[in-house]
């Protein structure tokens, strides 16, 4: 049978040939009658055999990391017979390891993100090096990790390559660190090979900074003419944190006057001071408010960094604006009796300059020929007024500052012209009446009514009478209906168209004013030739035809 030990050949041997071992048959008695042969991958090129002795030699340098074992076949032949002495057999040559490979970090580059202010012991990242040497062969591939750069903030676990925080870090002081890790094989013993890697460790932000005002005192100004909602200025705080952790909200901490408000511009992170209530320079021209600023988002565990909000004081100076005159009332209503003489007193309007300088005021009336106003605001008439022409006057009174004629205010003034009884009642229309020749006594000829242009406080009441002459010699009589109407009746039987074709009756109408006024109104009565029915229709028709130029037969 075959006789051999396990074959090993060290890698990286520089000699021309290196004795690996000997193959032999136990039938070989050393008389050189056997011939040994080597077959298989590497036979003749990497390994050769002494055909006589069976000694195997490596004739080239081997690299275990390239090939760690060779499987060869051996034959032994009896030279005399040419026959195989032993059956062909497979054997293995193992390449033994030497420490010829340094550790390598294959997952480079390394980058890790860890929250700032993380406590000691927080895991950052694990780095792993690979060593191509044989892990089963001594310590050639047993690695030890150490920190070349990164103290005192980081540490590395020697056997695992786990990087941990060893000291709290503040992103606001330094936001990234380069850590250099070394991996050594041979567990760091002499002759060990090493490799290094760099790890970029970035600190993510936590909200460990509160916003702080850039200024402890601000000065703003606002015009007294500014409407509510006006932005009067901005205030600014800074926060060393970034992103969401730097978002802030401004608010009023102190404003006794409740005149101002602060809104936050979330794009610029500024506080905008706005006017909540209109200001009046003459009432208050200096304000002081205190504003505070806080982060929008604060985690409970970070509250210790946000105990007292930063505050600032804002002085606000109100700027005076020359304001137009201010009337005592928004409008005035005055009364004056009609027919009062020119220059009569109507009323007084009053405006003042609301500013501190108290400019004198000049008054004027826009487009009026009926009224006048003096520098004291006294309104008088320039003509006598007639209520029956105009009962109300709508005036526009303008007040102008003497020191600044551009400062003008106008208000409406309503003047009511009060009635006096200066008009007597009169017929409400023109009456044309007709009576038949054959009319009997007591026949109703006409119903009349009256109007009075005067205004009556109570209801108008009119009194109807015939004139004295007509009462004494009248063919007609009048009855007052007591309802502002009266009826005219015949006072005799029969009329003669030929003798008296027309009657003119004077009717007196009196009103109930104080003093009472009376007018004389003439009623025209035509005598008609009527048919038997006593209708005046034909008479009226005849009248119409005559008035149009036709003659009736």
């Amino acid at each position: 049978g075959w006789v051999w030990n396990q074959f090993f050949v060290p890698e990286e041997m520089n000699t021309t040939s290196h004795h690996v071992g000997r193959l032999r048959s136990d039938l070989d008695n050393g008389n050189n009658s056997f011939q040994y042969k080597l077959l298989g991958a590497g036979a003749g090129s990497t390994f050769i055999i002494d055909e006589r002795t069976g000694d195997i030699y490596a004739i080239e340098k081997l690299d275990r990391e390239e090939r760690s074992l060779y499987i060869l076949r051996a034959q032994v032949i009896d030279i005399t017979t040419g026959r195989a002495v032993e059956p062909e057999s497979e054997f293995v040559i193992k390449v033994s390891d030497i420490n010829d490979n340094e550790p390598k970090f294959l997952d480079e580059p390394y980058e890790a993100i860890v929250p700032e202010m993380s406590p000691e012991g927080t895991l950052v990242i694990q780095v792993t090096a690979s060593d191509a040497d044989d892990p089963s062969s001594g310590n050639n591939a047993r690695l030890l990790y150490s920190l070349l750069q990164g103290q005192p903030y980081f540490s590395v676990e020697p056997t695992t390559g786990v990087i941990r925080i060893s000291s709290k870090m503040d992103r606001e002081l330094q936001d990234e660190y380069w850590v250099i890790i070394q991996a050594k094989d041979m567990i760091g013993q002499p002759g060990a090979l090493s490799g290094t890697t760099s790890v970029l460790i970035k600190l993510s932000d936590v909200n460990d900074n509160k916003p702080i005002f850039k200024e402890s005192l601000y000065r703003l100004t606002v015009s007294e003419s500014a409407p509510t909602g006006t932005s009067i200025g901005t205030i600014m705080a800074y926060d060393n944190d970034i992103g969401e952790n730097a978002e802030m909200d401004y608010s009023i901490e102190e404003d006794d006057s409740q005149t101002f408000d602060i809104i936050t511009n979330h794009e610029t992170q500024e506080g905008i001071v706005i006017l909540k209530k209109k200001v009046n320079f003459e009432h208050q021209n200096h304000y002081g408010i205190r504003a505070k600023v806080k982060n929008h988002h604060v985690d409970k565990q970070l509250m210790k960094y946000h105990t007292e909000a930063s505050t600032t004081f804002i002085k606000i100076q109100v700027e005076d604006v020359d304001e137009p005159p201010l009337f005592l009332l928004p409008y005035y209503i005055f009364e004056i009796f009609e027919e009062t003489p020119q220059g009569s007193f109507v009323g007084v309007v009053s405006a003042t300059d609301p500013d501190n300088r108290k400019s004198p005021i000049r008054y004027s009336i826009t487009r009026s020929k009926v009224f006048n106003i003096d520098d004291n605001g006294t309104i008088t008439t320039t003509n006598s007024l007639d209520r029956e022409i105009s009962a109300w006057y709508n005036l526009s009174i303008t007040a102008t500052e003497k020191y600044n004629i551009e400062q003008i205010s106008s208000i409406p003034v309503y003047v009511q012209v009060l009635n006096i009884n200066d008009h007597a009642p009169e017929f409400s229309q023109y009456y044309e009446s007709y009576v038949c020749e054959n009319a009997g006594s007591g026949q109703v000829i006409q119903t009349i009514s009256a109007v009075d242009r005067d205004e009556s406080i109570e209801e108008h009441h009119f009194y109807f009478n015939l004139s004295v002459e007509d009462t004494n010699s009248s063919s007609f009589t009048i009855i007052d209906n007591q309802d502002n109407t009266a009826v005219i009746l015949t006072n005799r039987t029969g009329f003669n168209l030929q003798e008296e074709p027309i009657f003119y009756i004077s009717i007196l109408i009196a009103d109930n004013g104080i003093p009472s006024l009376t007018s004389t109104n003439t009623l025209t009565i035509h005598v008609c030739d009527c048919d038997d029915s006593g209708s005046t229709q034909t008479c009226q028709y005849q009248e119409l035809m005559l008035s149009m130029g036709f003659k009736t037969e």
Epitope: L217, R219, D256, N285, H286, Y287, G288, R290, F313
Partner: antibody, heavy 120, light 107 residues
Amino acid sequence: QVQLQESGPGLVKPSQTLSLTCTVSGGSISSSGYYWSWIRQHPGKGLEWIGYIYYTGSAYYNPSLKSRVTISVDTSKNQFSLKLSSVTAADTAVYYCARDGSSGWYFQYWGQGTLVTVSS
Amino acid sequence: EIVLTQSPGTLSLSPGERATLSCRASRNISSSYLAWYQQKPGQAPRLLIYGPSSRATGIPDRFSGSGSGTDFTLTISRLEPEDFTVYYCQQYGSSFTFGPGTKVDIK
């Protein structure tokens, strides 16, 4: 600590212009938010505010003195000045310069005052 | 303008006693706009209280201020010998006006 010091003639003739200067030390006159005032005190009487100025040159005066008062500022010299024209004996007083406070318009820092007498 | 009236004109008290000085405004002012000053002869006024109850830097806690609207008070809880002098109130809301002063003298 801010300190203020008034300087100027102690005697002014009637109808002339009274001129005083206040020099600020221990702080900048250009400090944001602070107003620099002149206040006077007639002999044995109360205090009367004359006017103030901001470092930008914006001034505001007591309405009763407005027509005669001018306050100006020189930031390069850290000084501000008062001019009161057409003086009469009624303007005889101790004149103080002052700075307002960090939390309001009260007067936190005062100069020691200078007596100005108006007399011919 | 806002007129400030101080009463009494003179307050005669003994050291160790409590002093109550009054300042009345002619119209309402916000409490944040009133200050008190102390003035010793030949010296400039010194800020005591502002707004109306905050003590200025270095002012002893025996001085306190209170009030709102039109009525304000300066209280000196226990008079020390150096407290016998003149006190002024000042409003700084509508322009700046001072009260006529109250003199605290030794009884």
